[in-house]
């Protein structure tokens, strides 16, 4: 990773764009900590492994989180 992580936050910009859950490889939610004062959501896409920072305050992103957790709860026994 090019930037040293002595701080630091991961996201330089954030996106409101909803992501299709089917195109998601992984969704990480990083809670606020001493390293970064804000919650960060990082979506890793199946296509090319693109990583995109999502806006935790966006309605569309909140809906995505709900959809993903619903999907996970369906899968788990």
């Amino acid at each position: 990773v090019p930037l040293s992580r002595t701080v630091r936050c991961t996201c330089i910009s954030i996106s409101n764009q909803p992501v299709n859950p089917r195109s998601l490889e992984k969704l990480e939610i990083i809670p606020a900590s001493q390293f970064c004062p804000r919650v960060e959501i990082i979506a890793t896409m199946k296509k090319k492994g693109e990583k995109r920072c999502l806006n935790p305050e966006s309605k569309a992103i909140k809906n995505l989180l709900k959809a993903v957790s619903k999907e996970r709860s369906k899968r788990s026994p």
């Epitope: 990773v1 090019p2 930037l3 991961t10 910009s13 954030i14 996106s15 804000r38 995109r52 806006n55």
Partner: antibody
Framework: QVQLVESGGGVVQPGRSLRLSCTAS????????MHWVRQAPGKGLEWVAV????????YYADSVKGRFTISRDNSKNTLYLQMNSLRAEDTAVYYC?????????????????WGQGTTVTVSS | EIVLTQSPGTLSLSPGERATLSCRAS???????LAWYQQKPGQAPRLLIY???SRATGIPDRFSGSGSGTDFTLTISRLEPEDFAVYYC??????????FGPGTKVDIK
């Protein structure tokens, strides 16, 4: 429409200070990282500094470290570059540029919106 | 510090021809961190390609990017009159954080 407008350039003597501003419109400024990039007369592009959307991450080119400070005021949709101890080699057109949507330290989406630039001339 | 070298320095071609621009890094660069820009005289740069091969919004499909490791290429399949400009590659990496190549000028033969 999406727009960045730089201001504050001018002619200044070596050793003096100048503050550049970049006013954003047409997008949610508080969600985007922002850069300053400069271009000396007849030369290529040189990256100067970056600040993340919330101001938590700030990085500088070695050539300006300790002399220039990048900052932002999200309530005013404005990016700043405070330039101290100016040198003749700082003479350039200074552009502000927006970092791509969702960009992060693992994946770089490029600088997708640029202003038209403001000219800084350092001369005695 | 990673240094980017672009070749050729100047490319003289006619409209309709194919342009192949090279960007070479002094050490390996992740394709996630490579971008290409176009700049016309008196204008600000314009983002063409990010992630080595993804076209930016509104960029015509005659522009394509490829490559990995230390060798990257920008291809313009058929030059249009408005494509004559200077092209810069750029990488995002360790200090200095963002580095531009010296540019390739594409001019009319």
């Amino acid at each position: 429409q999406v727009q960045l407008v730089e201001s504050g350039g001018g002619v200044v003597q070596p050793g003096r200070s100048l503050r550049l501003s970049c006013t954003a419109s047409g997008f949610t400024f508080s969600q985007y990282g922002m850069h300053w990039v400069r271009q000396a007369p007849g030369k290529g592009l040189e990256w100067v500094a970056v600040i993340s959307y919330g101001g938590d991450i700030k990085y500088y080119a070695d050539s300006v470290k300790g002399r220039f400070t990048i900052s932002r005021d999200n309530s005013k949709n404005t990016l700043y570059l405070q330039m101290n101890s100016l040198r003749a080699e700082d003479t350039a057109v200074y552009y502000c540029a927006r970092e791509g949507e969702g960009s992060n330290i693992y994946y770089y989406y490029g600088m997708d919106v640029w202003g038209q630039g403001t000219t800084v001339t350092v001369s005695s | 510090e990673i240094v980017l070298t672009q070749s050729p320095g100047t490319l003289s071609l006619s409209p309709g021809e194919r342009a192949t621009l090279s960007c070479r890094a002094s050490q390996s660069v992740s394709s996630s961190y490579l971008a290409w820009y176009q700049q016309k005289p008196g204008q600000a740069p314009r983002l063409l390609i990010y992630g080595a091969s993804s076209r930016a919004t509104g960029i015509p499909d005659r522009f394509s990017g490829s490559g990995s490791g230390t060798d990257f290429t920008l291809t313009i399949s058929r030059l249009e009159p408005e494509d004559f400009a200077v092209y810069y590659c750029q990488q995002y990496g360790s200090s200095p954080i963002f580095t531009f190549g010296p540019g390739t000028k594409v001019d009319i033969k």
